[in-house]
């Protein structure tokens, strides 16, 4: 019995087609992805093949103005239109709190939304009961397939799930649910979830009875043969894991941003064994036409976005200096504003020991593309912020050793004075450079704000300590020559859309007046 699994993950609000790098579409003939194009391909496959499932492995939320404005209603609407069969909860589905998940998505989705390792407690338990499920048995042709969901147990550190959701270990939580499916005589089981490729592989290895793992979170690109675009494969598609009980379990993921549609064909025998598995992600490029009815719907929903981008978010009473003449040479108040917003966006999980889980921010000065003049009545709009941060990136959470941070700050000034983008703006960090010293030895003082303290204060950076840092995904991926970050990071979790982080902060503060205050000397 042959099953075709179509899958997406980490779409991050890319409802409209995008450029090849998943930023705003400029030249339509070269654009990719988007729900209208995805629908065309999905329908083509549904017509051609008998047993098809369309699955999403989480993180539909967060990433463009679509999410900022529609707050998840757009996800429910267009996923319903595409007739998704199931979705797993990702960490970003909790970005607007549990209410921001329940109302727009859980209550509106016409497909099951899954996670076996999220347990509700207290007053939330009855409120959310039945709105998401640990598993769902889906009829497919003459057969049934069990889908069991999972979500990163790091979600409380990455998003805002509140205090009434407990995120259990994925493997511990999945095993009893898979066992339950087996007792229901369901012998074809897909684990669909959002914990990253390493955890996906562990699930394939450790959870008895899981036949296929469809993952997300790590934006992993797998491909067999010559890849069709710029993404470099992390392995073959599917990636085969040998389970502890001796079975070959295919593991798949489909990069991110709706650029590809994962396409996996599985042949099962009567016992539910995977006899063969093959496929590849399908690049959703302009050779696939956008479906006209979905496209018309997108255009209808778009109108509200254009109105939103000119509305006032808040006011500034000072000039926001985002000029390259400042931000690539010295501390600039636009850099301070953005870093403060980045830390503020990650305020969560205080306890008796820690006032917050992260206190530090770094930001390449070259990523700040425009100032904002306060003389326009002080008004700040989304449009203004899009000029400052035009690349459509995210502000991510990484874990780095102190020694890596020290290398990053040396790189920041290794060719100082040439107006290059690698000069770092900071938050929760005090750095002193001596530019008379030779490159690679210019950082003379590097103090960082403590997190394990009731009164935050600056302490010298310890080379062997592991620190959490918020930074642009561009830096996490080694951009502007920060190869040491990419090579040495110990953990990397994708965060929220950059403009959204700053706009939310400005809306919260209402009036802002960031200063140059001696963070960089």
């Amino acid at each position: 019995w042959e099953l075709t699994i179509l899958h997406t993950n980490d779409v991050h609000s890319r409802l409209e087609q995008t450029s090849e790098d998943s930023s705003k579409c400029v030249n339509a003939s070269r654009c990719m992805g988007g729900v209208a194009r995805l629908f065309t391909k999905v329908q083509q496959i549904r017509r051609a093949e008998p047993n098809v499932l369309l699955l999403d492995a989480g993180d539909q939320y967060q990433g463009t103005i679509w999410f900022t404005v529609y707050k998840g209603a757009e996800v429910a609407h267009f996923m319903n239109a595409l007739r998704y069969d199931a979705m797993a909860l990702g960490n970003h589905e909790f970005d607007n709190g549990v209410e921001g998940l329940i109302e727009p998505l859980l209550k509106e989705a016409k497909f099951p939304i899954l996670s076996a390792n999220i347990k509700a407690k207290g007053p939330l338990a009855s409120q959310i009961s039945g709105l998401y499920l640990p598993y769902k048995v889906l009829p497919v042709g003459d057969e049934v397939v069990g889908i069991v969901g999972y979500t990163s147990k790091e979600t409380p550190f990455l998003s805002n799930p509140g205090t009434n959701l407990v995120f259990e270990d994925e493997i511990t939580a999945l095993q009893p649910e898979v066992d339950k499916l087996k007792t229901l005589n369901v012998n074809k089981i897909i684990a669909l979830g959002h914990s990253g490729f390493e955890t996906d592989k562990l699930i394939a290895q450790k959870v008895r009875g899981v036949d296929v793992v469809v993952g997300g979170h790590s934006n992993t690109f797998l491909y067999t043969g010559n890849p069709p675009s710029k993404e470099v494969p992390a392995g073959k598609y599917p990636f085969i894991v040998t389970s502890d009980d001796g079975r070959k379990v295919p593991v798949v993921q489909a990069y991110a941003f709706g650029k590809y549609l994962g396409y996996l064909k599985i042949e099962f025998d009567e016992r539910g064994n995977v006899i063969s598995s093959h496929g590849n992600p399908i690049l959703l490029n302009s050779s696939i036409p956008e479906d006209p009815s979905i496209k018309a719907d997108i255009n209808k929903w778009r109108i509200k976005l254009d109105n939103y981008s000119t509305q006032e978010l808040g006011k500034t009473i000072v000039y926001l200096d985002g000029s390259s003449q400042s931000c690539r040479f010295r501390e600039c108040n636009m850099g301070n504003l953005i870093c403060d917003a980045m830390i503020n966006n990650n305020l969560r999980h205080a306890d008796e020991m820690f006032w917050n889980h992260v206190s530090m921010c770094i930001l390449n000065g070259g990523g700040i593309r425009s100032p904002i003049d306060e003389r326009n009545n002080g008004t700040i709009t989304w449009e203004n912020l899009a000029a400052v941060l035009p690349f459509g990136g995210t502000f991510d959470l990484v874990q780095l050793k102190g020694s890596t941070l020290k290398k990053a700050f040396e790189h920041s000034v290794h060719r100082y004075g040439q107006s290059t983008g690698e000069f770092l703006q900071v938050g929760g960090i005090h750095v002193v450079y001596d530019l008379s010293r030779k490159p690679g030895d210019r950082v003379v003082k590097l103090d960082v704000l403590c997190t394990k303290c009731r009164v935050p204060s600056y302490d010298p950076l310890k080379m062997d300590e592991i620190y959490k840092v918020i930074l642009p995904n561009f830096l996490a991926n080694g951009g502007d020559g920060f190869q040491m970050i990419k090579d040495e990071l110990l953990r990397h979790d994708s965060g929220d859309q950059d403009i959204n982080v700053v706009s939310t902060y400005i809306s919260k503060m209402k009036v802002i007046y960031p200063a140059v205050e001696g963070r960089i000397k």
Epitope: W1, G141, D142, E143, T242, G246, K248, D269, E270, R271, N273, V274, I275, S276
Partner: antibody, heavy 114, light 107 residues
Framework: EVQLVQSGAEVKKPGASVKVSCKAS????????MNWVRQAPGQGLEWMGR????????FYSQKFKGRVTMTVDKSTSTVYMELSSLRSEDTAVYYC???????WGQGTTVTVSS | DIQMTQSPSSLSASVGDRVTITCRAS??????LNWLQQKPGGALKRLIY???SLDSGVPSRFSGSGSGTEYTLTISSLQPEDFATYYC?????????FGGGTKVEIK
């Protein structure tokens, strides 16, 4: 649990035909196909062909084409294998086996003797 | 048709021995290979499917490996109940074909 139960032993004369049945249970019968395999006394296994239950599609080994007919009765989840123009070398145990031979019938002995 | 050449055709071994049986295909069959066990009474049982996946209930002393045209069944420590005849089967292309069998006997 998958189970395949075959019909009883048959003794046939050369030139005659034999029809062996295989009743399946414990799985979604229409979603899969069934194989027929035979084993002559003291010999190895020989694949004869397969039938897809849902559509009745068949694929026969060239060696048996024209002599073998595989059919299906979906209402009783039963597959049949008929072999015609029997000769002495068709004396063998005939097995039905699920799609990728994960489960086997108990075998049906067919003896061709004058 | 794809020919499957199985070797050895028979072998004698003692309990606890490591036993290796090989199947060579006349052309590349990908991973499309099963290993079957037939006990003297005639009952057939699949041990390994898709070259290396172990059927449920099959002891972990059985393992399969290989690719392309060369495939191997290994019994890491032979047990009394393992004395039987073993067959490989390729299902990469029609007609499916079996190896000639390997009879494992008590030394």
């Amino acid at each position: 649990e998958v189970q395949l139960v075959q019909s009883g032993a048959e003794v046939k004369k050369p030139g005659a035909s034999v029809k062996v049945s295989c009743k399946a249970s414990g799985y979604t019968f229409t979603a899969y196909f069934m194989n027929w395999v035979r084993q002559a006394p003291g010999q190895g296994l020989e694949w004869m062909g397969r039938i897809y239950h849902n559509k009745g599609d068949t694929f026969y080994s060239q060696k048996f084409k024209g002599r073998v007919t595989m059919t299906v009765d979906k209402s009783t989840s039963t597959v049949y294998m008929e072999l015609s123009s029997l000769r002495s070398e068709d004396t063998a145990v005939y097995y039905c086996a699920t799609s990728y031979v994960g489960d086997w019938g108990q075998g049906t002995t067919v003896t061709v003797s004058s | 048709d794809i020919q499957m050449t199985q070797s050895p055709s028979s072998l004698s071994a003692s309990v606890g021995d490591r036993v290796t049986i090989t199947c060579r295909a006349s052309q590349d069959i990908g991973d499309s290979l099963n290993w079957l066990q037939q006990k003297p009474g005639g009952a057939l049982k699949r041990l390994i499917y898709a070259t290396s996946s172990l059927d449920s209930g099959v002891p972990s002393r059985f393992s399969g490996s290989g690719s392309g045209t060369e495939y191997t069944l290994t019994i890491s420590s032979l047990q009394p109940e393992d004395f039987a005849t073993y067959y490989c089967l390729q299902y990469a292309s029609f007609p499916w074909t079996f190896g000639g069998g390997t009879k494992v006997e008590i030394k």
